[in-house]
């Protein structure tokens, strides 16, 4: 936001170099995606709705975020799972829930896990149940890297803009 | 921190444009609030204690953070809940715990949930119990927007500076 | 990334002040550490492996991150715990799991908890079990401050680069 809240001399500097702040802003890619609530048995990320956005070069392709420029990014994601009363039948074995942010890079021929959270819930013992998972961290990423997610327990997702999301921003 | 760790030529540039770094810093509002431990049955945010702070325009009014300038912010919050051991009832019903960061904006006439986490805990045989919830994400906010929280299970909060907090910073 | 994606006039500005962007980058310390998987009964942080890194002044000493310059930092950490299946006892006592990020500063003669998460798990009928904890927040730190972690339940850690990590970056 060039010129906002600047002292006169700083505002003058910004006028003399009008593109300086703008250039800096172009180096601040950010994205926030939300899980599509209309897709109940898959997790499809959406950027064009509610509070979701893609800024300064981030794009969404094949359900993956494409990293626009090399640098350090903070990457984060959350999911919320739930189960209704008496959903399991003849088992007391736990339900495995997991959510992972993965990196697919030209440097590696496979998906590298960046962030992983896991939970076993015991539907037979605790019904109804609810569980939230969140994680985020800073990573050195390269232009063209693909960030995606993998989730175990998709049928149990609570899909809303404030419960299931995935994002990243350049530091 | 203008001039720290700069090469001679960069330091010279900073001296020529003395407000440039400062101007950039004034565009970096940040806040970190902690739950007031003296208020046991409410969640009141405090900024003037322990590690809490308000910087570069953030203010706290009516238990809400006021967004000082339009832009993208990373918003986060954590709560920890606990329950003490008691004489359990075998058929005790579940306790619903939830924590939400909400946005009140001039654009909407209601509170919009930004971040939501939820949990069912089953007191009884599982006493004592402890549960932590954390979430955070990037949002496009407008000057004057109000960020607040809503919590289900307030009497069970473990109120300390490192367990219950709420914050935001401009990207 | 000086000159990347800049308009001609902004690129010219960057050439006139060649160190300006670089200087800005030197004020962006960041670190991401992962738990050493070869150490099963301790939590030793590593920076020279997998996706881990230390940048712009951060260093790792005595299992602590040393803050390179005063300012506001976002600090974060995650752990994942697990327990394997065994012949269950319904009355087994709870296991206390906790993870804390602590600050040791010249201003205080003791470790100050910055971020704390806690959980009680009940082995027995709930075996196997898995539990994830994450937290992060913004703090005003001083050059020379030491950031470290304390964990209860270390033998139960799931040590992998994507499950157990600790990091910080300057805002």
């Amino acid at each position: 936001l060039p010129g906002v809240g600047l002292t006169p001399s700083a505002a003058q500097t910004a006028r003399q170099h009008p593109k300086m702040h703008l250039a800096h802003s172009t180096l601040k890619p950010a994205a926030h995606l939300i899980g599509d609530p209309s897709k109940q048995n898959s997790l499809l990320w959406r950027a064009n709705t509610d509070r979701a956005f893609l800024q300064d070069g981030f794009s969404l392709s094949n359900n993956s975020l494409l990293v626009p420029t090399s640098g350090i990014y903070f990457v984060y994601s959350q999911v919320v799972f739930s189960g209704k009363a008496y959903s399991p039948k003849a088992t007391s074995s736990p339900l495995y829930l997991a959510h992972e942010v993965q990196l697919f890079s030209s440097q590696y021929p496979f998906h590298v896990p960046l962030l992983s959270s896991q939970k076993m819930v015991y539907p037979g013992l605790q019904e109804p149940w609810l569980h939230s998972m969140y994680h985020g961290a800073a990573f050195q990423l390269t232009q063209g890297d693909q960030l995606s997610t993998h989730t175990d327990g998709i049928p149990h997702l609570v899909l809303s803009p404030s419960t299931v999301f995935f994002g990243a921003f350049a530091l | 921190l203008p001039g720290v760790g700069l090469t001679p030529s960069a330091a010279q540039t900073a001296r020529q444009h003395p407000k440039m770094h400062l101007a950039h810093s004034t565009l970096k509002p940040a806040a970190h609030l902690i739950g007031d431990p003296s208020k046991q049955n409410s969640l009141l945010w405090r900024a003037n204690t322990d590690r809490a702070f308000l910087q570069d325009g953030f203010s706290l009014s009516n238990n809400s953070l006021l967004v000082p300038t339009s832009g993208i912010y990373f918003v986060y919050s954590q709560v920890v809940f606990s329950g003490k051991a008691y004489s359990p009832k075998a058929t005790s019903s579940p306790l619903y715990l939830a924590h939400e960061v909400q946005l009140f904006s001039s654009q909407y006439p209601f509170h919009v949930p930004l971040l939501s986490s939820q949990k069912m805990v089953y007191p009884g045989l599982q006493e004592p119990w402890l549960h932590s919830m954390y979430h955070g994400a990037a949002f496009q906010l407008t000057q004057g927007d109000q960020l607040s929280t809503h919590t289900d299970g307030i009497p069970h909060l473990v109120l300390s500076p490192s367990t219950v907090f709420f914050g935001a910073f401009a990207l | 990334l000086p000159g990347v994606g800049l308009t001609p006039s902004a690129a010219q500005t960057a050439r006139q002040h060649p160190k300006m962007h670089l200087a800005h980058s030197t004020l962006k310390p960041a670190a991401h550490l992962i738990g050493d998987p070869s150490k099963q009964n301790s939590l030793l942080w590593r920076a020279n492996t997998d996706r881990a890194f230390l940048q712009d002044g951060f260093s790792l000493s005595n299992n602590s991150l040393l803050v390179p310059t005063s300012g506001i930092y976002f600090v974060y950490s995650q752990v994942v715990f697990s327990g394997k299946a065994y012949s269950p006892k319904a009355t087994s006592s709870p296991l206390y799991l906790a993870h804390e990020v602590q600050l040791f500063s010249s201003q205080y003669p003791f470790h100050v908890p910055l971020l704390s998460s806690q959980k009680m798990v009940y082995p027995g009928l709930q075996e196997p079990w898995l539990h994830s904890m994450y937290h992060g927040a913004a703090f005003q730190l001083t050059q020379g401050d030491q950031l470290s972690t304390h964990t209860d339940g270390i033998p139960h850690l799931v040590l992998s680069p994507s499950t157990v990590f600790f990091g910080a970056f300057a805002l």
């Epitope: 048995n41 008496y86 959903s87 399991p88 039948k89 003849a90 088992t91 007391s92 074995s93 736990p94 339900l95 495995y96 829930l97 997991a98 896991q118 076993m120 539907p123 037979g124 013992l125 605790q126 019904e127 175990d152 327990g153 998709i154 049928p155 149990h156 | 075998a90 058929t91 005790s92 089953y122 009884g124 045989l125 599982q126 | 394997k84 299946a85 012949s87 269950p88 319904a90 009928l125 196997p128 898995l130």
Partner: antibody
Amino acid sequence: EVQLVESGGGLVQPGGSLRLSCAASGYTFSSYWIEWVRQAPGKGLEWVGEINPGSGSTIYNEKFKGRATFSADNSKNTAYLQMNSLRAEDTAVYYCADGYHGYWGQGTLVTVSS
Amino acid sequence: DIQMTQSPSSLSASVGDRVTITCKSSQSLLYSTNQKNFLAWYQQKPGKAPKLLIYWASTRDSGVPSRFSGSGSGTDFTLTISSLQPEDFATYYCQQYYSYPRTFGQGTKVEIK
């Protein structure tokens, strides 16, 4: 439609090994445990153990520990049972089941004989 | 291991009869926190896989006729067929899923009289 389909049964020499497959379709595979149950001819049902495909967690009946190994390939929605050092008394129909939803496969017959 | 004992081992009955099969466990299958019994009943016909009839001791699986009912708690459980039909002649098994290893009763064969 949900289906569990076992394969890999047949005649095996004593001391030999078998690898049974259980292909799942019609539901999300990774979060739910796959149980293995066997039934000797004219006898009752015996629980061998179970695997969680997503986490890789396994639980074995002590009777089969060391001889049975469970694995899973999430990309193929398939669970596997490997049994070693087979004896005549291992002759049985082997079933895979998902107790969470109450699904069972049709079973595959393994005959251990020389 | 939890031992499951069914009785009788076999029984002969006619179409329309009320049939009762019992199952006893060597320890309680009741989880007191939620008052659920970790017991299931299966029906198996010759050459076929077992079919789930009842879970949580008394909950009928979808598609199972209402003439099948389960009852009991703790260590004593009963499967009742209120009016035996021709397609009900089969072997019935109880199973506990309270603890590992999961264990089955030895089975009760229901034959035509």
